[in-house]
Amino acid sequence: FERTRSLQDPCSNCPAGTFCDNNRNQICSPCPPNSFSSAGGQRTCDICRQCKGVFRTRKECSSTSNAECDCTPGFHCLGAGCSMCEQDCKQGQELTKKGCKDCCFGTFNDQKRGICRPWTNCSLDGKSVLVNGTKERDVVCGPSPADLSPGASSVTPPAPAREPGHSPQ
């Protein structure tokens, strides 16, 4: 099938990094500077993405693959292929329409992005609070009071927050 196809379409022989040049009797020509073709048999090369402004180059464009961008410090990528850069907040904050705001009491965020999530409710698992939560850290649940018999000293990591959602502003 491949042989048949190449007999029918000479362009199918052009590998990635080249294009099938109609102006030169369908000869495979290398992609011009600042362009690429990631698959064979292409009739044009695509223009390389330029990482400008708040974007910085994570991977240079080559003849066979597009450039990849990430964000300048203080920002993080959003969207497919880092199509946008979103402002970082500090741990203990979340990004609102009016900028970074501290997590409300009873919620935390241990990252520079994302939303504040409710502290784990230890009592739902029959446990007690071993370490109090903060804006930046979830509570640490310990054994239930009934488990505190001599020799019992297991500390359970916190269960994931049940209802992640925006804290009220």
Epitope: Q87, K97, G99
Partner: nanobody, 121 residues
Framework: QVQLVESGGGLVQAGGALRLSCAAS????????IGWFRQAPGKEREGVLC????????IYADSVKGRFTISRDNAKNTVYLQMNSLKPEDTAVYYC??????????????WGQGTQVTVSS
């Protein structure tokens, strides 16, 4: 043709002040945020301040708190960056940019060409 043009840069002694302007032409700033970024020689570009279309201010760089302020004059289609108590580490090319909102930037945003600020000790 859409353009952002920065002006007001120059050479100033440490402790001095400068006011940078970012003038927009080809579009109105009324519905756009305006951010200021800077890039020092050999360093990565960093956010400084941003003002939203409603006048809310976002400070990206903690190092400018209490020294830099941002304001807008929609009638003049211009945003100002007032820089007081300048330090040698504020030396950089300063750029203005027009995102839709201060928290999020895309490759469609308009950027100015930049204005050089040099603070000597």
């Amino acid at each position: 043709q859409v353009q952002l043009v920065e002006s007001g840069g120059g050479l100033v002694q440490a402790g001095g002040a400068l006011r940078l302007s970012c003038a927009a032409s080809g579009f109105t700033l009324d519905y756009s945020a305006i951010g200021w970024f800077r890039q020092a020689p050999g360093k990565e570009r960093e956010g400084v301040l941003c003002i939203s279309s409603s006048g809310d201010v976002t400070i990206y760089a903690d190092s400018v708190k209490g020294r830099f302020t941002i304001s807008r004059d929609n009638a003049k289609n211009t945003v100002y960056l007032q820089m007081n108590s300048l330090k040698p580490e504020d030396t950089a090319v300063y750029y203005c940019v027009a995102p839709r909102i201060c928290s999020t930037y895309s490759s469609d945003d308009y950027w100015g060409q930049g204005t050089q600020v040099t603070v000597s000790s």
